[in-house]
């Protein structure tokens, strides 16, 4: 799915209002310095691509985060604010339903969610804005200068 035409500000608002709190709940008891963020993204569409991948695609050691509250809210936000996203996810949803019934929090899953927090942080606060657009410049732009 191409995330270029999403309403980024609405997705950001959804993240700050609810999704971030669910990620914090999932990570509760884990120090923010415990995992080193290694996954990065260059612009907002790329960030959403990486967020989708880490949230919904099974990985070694973390079979599925898709049934977690933050994942369900992420899916809802993308469905609402990214035109045509829902249609692309029908087959993926069927595969997820077959994947796993129970939720098990492993250290690998905690690390993955820590990476997700870094991706969301980057999505929310990119530094370079394109003229007249809600999207942002790529890394390889010739410019390349960049609590709770």
């Amino acid at each position: 799915y191409d995330f270029t035409n999403c309403d980024f500000e609405k997705i950001k608002a959804a993240y700050l209002s609810t999704i971030s709190k669910d990620l914090i709940t999932y990570m509760s008891g884990t120090k923010s310095t415990e995992f080193n963020n290694t996954v990065s993204c260059s612009n907002r569409p790329h960030c959403l691509t990486e967020i989708q991948s880490l949230t919904f695609n099974p990985t070694a050691g973390c079979a599925s985060l898709a049934k977690e509250m933050f994942a369900m809210k992420t899916k809802a936000a993308l469905a609402i604010w990214c035109p045509g996203y829902s249609e692309t996810q029908i087959n993926a949803t069927q595969a997820m339903k077959k994947a796993r019934k129970s939720k098990v929090t492993t250290n690998k899953c905690l690390e993955q969610v820590s990476q997700l927090q870094g991706l969301w942080r980057r999505f929310n606060r990119p530094l370079l804005k394109q003229q007249g657009s809600s999207d942002y410049k790529d890394d390889d732009d010739k410019h390349h200068h960049h609590h709770h």
């Epitope: 500000e9 609405k10 950001k12 608002a13 993240y15 700050l16 209002s17 971030s20 914090i24 923010s32 310095t33 080193n36 963020n37 990065s40 260059s42 927090q117 870094g118 969301w120 942080r121 980057r122 999505f123 929310n124 606060r125 990119p126 530094l127 370079l128 804005k129 410049k137 890394d139 390349h144 200068h145 960049h146 609590h147 709770h148």
Partner: antibody
């Protein structure tokens, strides 16, 4: 706990340049925006610019655009702010600050400040 | 640039009394229903410290006598019962539009 430690005070001549460093410890460096803010004696806070160390992307306050350069070295978790063509009105305390964990955009960790005095 | 104007420039309040600081933006700092306005406290010789984020959310470890309200262009920081340790300069900051800008500061003293 994340800490930002800045380089020591500097005294500079008008027309020269100054480079202030800000070393991060106790947490991930590359995926947080790092900002530079200055405060002239008895005055308010003024945002100068920021860098995303992950790829070196920067954003500058146009007021300083031609004179300030912000860089970062991921290998040493250090951000730098260089200000050129110094004048007396650049006398100030220069702070580095890191954005929060969640992308809210507030500055939750600050360096101790570096005093730069510009005098002939 | 968005200009942030705080009022008053200085304020003297008795211990235990309420202190109110206002911040007005030259244009709205709201986006998608959220207000991208933060408040900081700065004591002499120290860097600023976050008090409130997004207009009304208390920063980590900040006492609940501090509160914030407002949206769009008009925001208020309130200290419900002034304590001696609250003597400081207070700044509002908008992060909705580059360049990020701060108010000129409000100096709070004890009467």
């Amino acid at each position: 706990e994340v800490q930002l430690v800045q380089s020591g005070a500097e005294v500079k001549k008008p027309g020269s340049s100054v480079k202030v460093s800000c070393k991060a410890s106790g947490g991930t460096f590359s995926t947080y925006n790092m900002h530079w803010v200055r405060q002239a004696p008895g005055q308010g806070l003024e945002w100068m610019g920021a860098i995303y160390p992950g790829n070196g992307e920067t954003s500058y306050n146009q007021k300083f655009k031609d004179r300030v350069t912000i860089t970062a070295d991921k290998s040493t978790s250090t951000a730098y702010m260089e200000l050129s063509s110094l004048r007396s009105e650049d006398t100030a305390v220069y702070y580095c600050a890191r954005e929060d964990d969640y992308g809210e955009g507030y500055f939750d960790v600050w360096g101790q400040g570096t005093t730069v005095t510009v005098s002939s | 640039d968005i200009v942030m104007t705080q009022s008053p420039d200085s304020l003297a309040v008795s211990l235990g009394e309420r202190a109110t600081i206002n911040c007005r933006a030259s244009e709205s700092v709201d986006n998608s229903g959220l207000s991208f306005m933060h408040w900081y406290q700065q004591k002499p010789g120290q860097p600023p410290k976050l008090l409130l984020y997004r207009a009304s959310n208390l920063g980590s470890g900040i006492p609940d006598r501090f509160s914030g309200s407002g949206s769009g262009t008009d925001f208020t920081l309130t200290i419900s019962s002034l304590q001696a340790e609250d003597v400081a300069v207070y700044y509002c900051q908008q992060i909705n539009t580059d360049p990020l800008t701060f108010g000129q500061g409000t100096k709070l003293e004890i009467k």
